[in-house]
Each structure stands twice: as C-alpha cells, then as structure tokens.
C-alpha cells in the first residue's frame, strides 16, 4: 500500500494509473466503500462522500491513463485509505494528514516560550524535528517547546514530520518582539543635547501599545518616570512628561527621545518599557547616560564624569599634544597649577576615546575660557 503524507490546509494529488493510455472508467472510494468521484465518459461524477466539494480530478490526464484524486484544503480527518478502481484492479493509497501550529501567536516577546503542537491522525506515530533560523535543532513528539526565545529565533522555523519513512515539511514564521539592543550607553559633555533611540528588531503592519521611561539618576535616591507615551498604528503621542528634564519625543518610529541638555544631575540609567496591545509582558531596553564636565577653579583643573561607567574606563587630563598629566580609573581627576594652553579631558576604554572635553587654561592673571 502506497503512503502519502499531506499537510492540513494543503492540496494533495493521489495518483492512479491504468496500463491503457486512454480514458477509461475509474472510481475513487474511501475505506468505507463510499464513492468519492469517478467518470462517466468525459464527465466527472461525484459520490456522497464528505469530500464532495473538495475533491477533483484532471480530465486532461485521463487520456494518458492517469486518474488522479485531488483533495483540496486537507483536514486531519481526511486521513484514510483511498481505493482507485480501474481496469478491474484496485490501487490503495493511505493518506496521512498532519498539522503543525504554534501554541498561541507567532509574534512572541523576547524571553517567552514557543510551543509547536503536531496534529496527527489516530494510529500514527510521527516524529518531529524543527530547525530554528539560527540553526538550533529540537526534536519531539506531539509537542515541541523552546523556552526563553531570543532575537535570533526570529524567522522561518522548518519542521520535518517523519512517518513510515516518508516526510512532510512545515514552515512557520516566528517573530520575536524585541528592541534591537538590550542596552545602550550615551556619552555626552555637559550642556550638549542628548539623543536616545530605541529601534525595534521587528516590523509589523500595525503597532499599538504604550510605553514609559523610568530614570534612576546617579545622584537621586529613587527612580522617576520621565515620560509616558502611547503608540497607535506606529504613531507616537506623549501622554505625560516631567518638567525637569523636559524630554521631547519623535512622533514616528523608531522611538526617539531628546534631552535638551546633558547635566550631571541627569546622568544615570533608564529603562524604557513598551507594552504591546494583546501581548502579555513588556519589551525592555536599558539606556545609560554618562556626562562629563571639565572646570577650572582657582589653581585647580578638574575633570569629572557622572553616570554608570565601568571600572576599566580611564579618565585622563592632558595638555594638547602632550603626554597625559594624570590618568586614573576614577570618576574625577585634577591637576593643580595647570600650565596655560588647551587641556583635554578624555574618557577612554582600552585606548579608544569615548568622550572628550576641552578647556582652555589662560595664563594665571586671566580667567579660563570654556569652549
């Protein structure tokens, strides 16, 4: 008996061939001997089976001695043994229909779980193997689960169902809803405008939800909500914003926030959360702001940074085109009685400059000029 595997919702062609290469009488029946379809001369005739409106054949192939049964929009319950009667012979074909579906939605939040469920006909014992877009293989029986979805899990999952040494392939498109970056850091000189961007790692037709940026300033004892906003069909509207600082927000995606001035009291870290409509859980992106200030008070030239810096970052003070006068893994450095000239305050990581502030030191009788 020939075995054919089909996919739920798909179309399948069951073949039946006669030795004579001409149109002769044929009938297709199911295992209960109920007629599905056949011919009467050149006419296609249909029986009282439940397949009636989904069964078809190809007249053009009859003249070649081929009498296919085509079943459209396959259902699991179409799994059966189909019998083709032609030239006093019977050809049997066993059709097994499988379905593979994602547990809920195919749009899942980062960190959530994906469960794939296999629908199979009674009496079958299929095995399933799925390959994620990043090449990870998972195997299982009726259900397959992947916990803690990551951004790289977005894309087409290819699942192969094996039964009777035959296989059928399913492709399921999964979208992991997340920000492109889990965390970002912005380095700014005091007084500069700060731009925060929160690009999403996915695109959908309509995007609706609400969000909020909570900020924990380094100098503050508790965090504070800086802004709340709504997202409707990719249009952003601000609901509430603090007076200090007065953030501005772009009206279109990607989510974009502007802080008019980088000030030491704003240095710290924030957490932007985005709750999407009809989704449980939220998307998160951490953002950090490091602010630098270089000052000269009397005979003391000081450089300071505020905000979340790693212990391996180096803060230096140097006269332009000269060796660093002072260089420390600290958040403040200073030089007493600095020489006149253009001084540079540098925040660097393994030799790479992250932030730079210049201050002009004038001869001792005049006051300093800060560019």
């Amino acid at each position: 008996k020939k075995v054919v595997l089909g996919k739920k919702g798909d179309t399948v062609e069951l073949t039946c061939t006669a030795s004579q290469k001409k149109s002769i009488q044929f009938h297709w029946k199911n295992s209960n001997q109920i007629k599905i379809l056949g011919n009467q001369g050149s006419f296609l005739t249909k029986g009282p089976s439940k397949l009636n409106d989904r069964a078809d054949s190809r007249r053009s192939l009859w003249d070649q001695g081929n009498f296919p049964l085509i079943i459209k929009n396959l259902k699991i319950e179409d799994s059966d043994t189909y019998i083709c009667e032609v030239e006093d012979q019977k050809e049997e074909v066993q059709l097994l229909v499988f379905g593979l579906t994602a547990n809920s939605d195919t749009h899942l939040l980062q960190g959530q779980s994906l469960t794939l469920t296999l629908e199979s006909p009674p009496g079958s014992s299929p095995s399933v193997q799925c390959r994620s877009p990043r090449g990870k293989n998972i195997q299982g029986g009726k259900t397959l689960s992947v916990s803690q979805l990551e951004l790289q899990d977005s894309g087409t999952w290819t699942c192969t169902v094996l039964q009777n040494q035959k296989k059928v392939e399913f492709k399921i498109d999964i979208v992991v809803l997340a920000f492109q970056k889990a965390s970002s850091i912005v380095y700014k000189k005091e007084g500069e405008q700060v731009e925060f961007s929160f690009p999403l790692a996915f695109t959908v037709e309509k995007l609706t939800g609400s969000g909020e940026l909570w900020w924990q300033a380094e100098r503050a004892s508790s965090s504070k909500s800086w802004i709340t906003f709504d997202l409707k069909n990719k249009e952003v509207s601000v609901k509430r914003v603090t007076q200090d600082p007065k953030l501005q927000m772009g009206k279109k995606l990607p989510l974009h926030l502007t802080l008019p001035q980088a000030l030491p009291q704003y240095a710290g870290s924030g957490n932007l959360t985005l709750a999407l409509e009809a989704k449980t859980g939220k998307l998160h992106q951490e953002v950090n702001l490091v602010v630098m200030r270089a000052t000269q008070l009397q005979k003391n030239l000081t450089c300071e940074v505020w905000g979340p810096t790693s212990p391996k970052l180096m803060l230096s003070l140097k006269l332009e085109n000269k060796e660093a006068k002072v260089s420390k893994r600290e958040k403040a450095v200073w030089v007493l009685n600095p020489e006149a000239g253009m001084w540079q305050c540098l925040l660097s990581d393994s030799g790479q400059v992250l932030l730079e502030s210049n201050i002009k030191v004038l001869p001792t009788w005049s006051t300093p000029v800060q560019p």
């Epitope: 089909g6 296609l44 190809r58 007249r59 053009s60 003249d63 459209k72």
Partner: antibody, heavy 112, light 107 residues
Framework: QVQLQQWGAGLLKPSETLSLTCAVY????????WSWIRQPPGKGLEWIGE???????NYNPSLKSRVTISVDTSKNQFSLKLSSVTAADTAVYYC?????????WGQGTLVT | DIQMTQSPSSVSASVGDRVTITCRAS??????LAWYQHKPGKAPKLLIY???SLQSGVPSRFSGSGSGTDFTLTISSLQPEDFATYYC?????????FGQGTKLEIK
C-alpha cells in the same frame, strides 16, 4: 490567499534563451500543477506547459522542442526556459496555478 | 488540438445591457470549459469553471451554460467594470486551448 510573483529578462536577441521564474506565496504548492501561458501583442492566449511539485511536466506540442519547465520545491518556485527565441516569441508571459482551470495568475512579464 | 472559436470577436454594449458571448469547441469537451475576463495590463481572472460554476467572489450577473461543443457566457446587466476581453478555455485534453477572445466595448 495564494499569490504568484514572476520575474525574468524582458529584452532578448534572436537565438537567445528566454528565462522566467514564478514564486508561489501563501498557499499549497503540492497537489497543483503550475503553468506558463503567453499572449503575443494583439493576439489570444497560448498555453505553453505545466509542471507539478514532483517535476512531472506536460508541454504544448507546438513548443515542446524548445521548452523546459523546472521546479524548486524548497523555494516554492517554478521556471520557464524557451530556447532559440525569435521575434514571434514576443509576448506577455504569465504563470498560473492549475488543476483544470487557471487561477490565480501572475502579474505577467513582457518579453521582447 | 481542440480548436475553440468565440463569437462575436467584438461587441459594443451599454451599461445595463444583457450580453451573450458564445464559444464552440471543435470536438466534445463535455463540461470542461472555463471563462476568463482580461483587462489591459492585468492578469486574466477566472469567472466561470466547469461550464456553469461561478468562481468565488465573482458577481452573480455572470453566468455560464452549455455542454458538449456549444457554450455561452452571459452578463445579465453590464456594469462599467465589465468592459474587457473575454476568453473561453477547454480543459478536456492537452494542449489546453483558448478561444481567440471577445472584446466587449462601450457603445
């Protein structure tokens, strides 16, 4: 909703080989036959040939010696090659899904 | 090959008119016939299959009849969007063949 999207070179010189591809989106690829049909300027429709997912083909005898239709099931695509073209092969070429009737059709590609 | 002959090759009519197009097969094709509507720059659209079955989404003003060698497409009340070229096609045997087309124009 099944959609067919086709592409290929639109301008050829005599004796060259015409090459077109049609991608099937959003529906079953197996169980159907996939056809190529053409319409020369100001003329009627002419069936070129067809293929199914397992590579079984049927061709119009008038073009059979020059036509090759192939299938790539991994991409849900099928292709047409027509060799030794002449000015008489200038037409809009369509791909279409078929059991007995052609539905749906691709958007058409003018090949000159 | 089975030859399909349509008549008339063109017809002028007005909105609201009833229009009939005929198609004749050179041999018996029982009910293995379809009708298509084709507008310039667009893909042909299946209207009627198996001689008289209305394709899903096609307005009920379109109807088909006939069996054997003679077939008819009828548009009961012409609408402005119906002005196009109409083709019949036989699916009885290879090669599939089409009629030469009937152009329906505004009077």
């Amino acid at each position: 909703q099944v959609q067919l999207q086709q592409w290929g070179a639109g301008l050829l010189k005599p004796s060259e080989t015409l090459s077109l591809t049609c991608a099937v989106y959003g529906g079953s690829f197996s169980g159907y036959y996939w056809s190529w049909i053409r319409q020369p300027p100001g003329k009627g429709l002419e069936w070129i040939g067809e293929i199914n997912h397992s590579g079984s083909t049927n061709y119009n005898p008038s073009l059979k010696s020059r036509v090759t239709i192939s299938v790539d099931t991994s991409k849900n695509q099928f292709s047409l090659k027509l060799s030794s073209v002449t000015a008489a092969d200038t037409a809009v070429y369509y791909c279409a899904r078929v059991i007995n009737w052609f539905d749906p059709w691709g958007q058409g590609t003018l090949v000159t | 090959d089975i030859q399909m002959t349509q008549s008339p090759s063109s017809v002028s009519a007005s909105v609201g008119d009833r229009v009939t197009i005929t198609c004749r097969a050179s041999q018996d094709i029982s009910s293995w016939l379809a009708w298509y509507q084709h507008k310039p720059g667009k893909a042909p659209k299946l209207l009627i299959y198996a001689a008289s079955s209305l394709q899903s989404g096609v307005p009920s003003r379109f109807s088909g009849s006939g069996s054997g060698t003679d077939f008819t497409l009828t548009i009961s009340s012409l609408q402005p969007e119906d002005f196009a070229t109409y083709y019949c096609q036989q699916a009885n045997s290879f090669p599939y063949t089409f009629g030469q087309g009937t152009k329906l124009e505004i009077k």
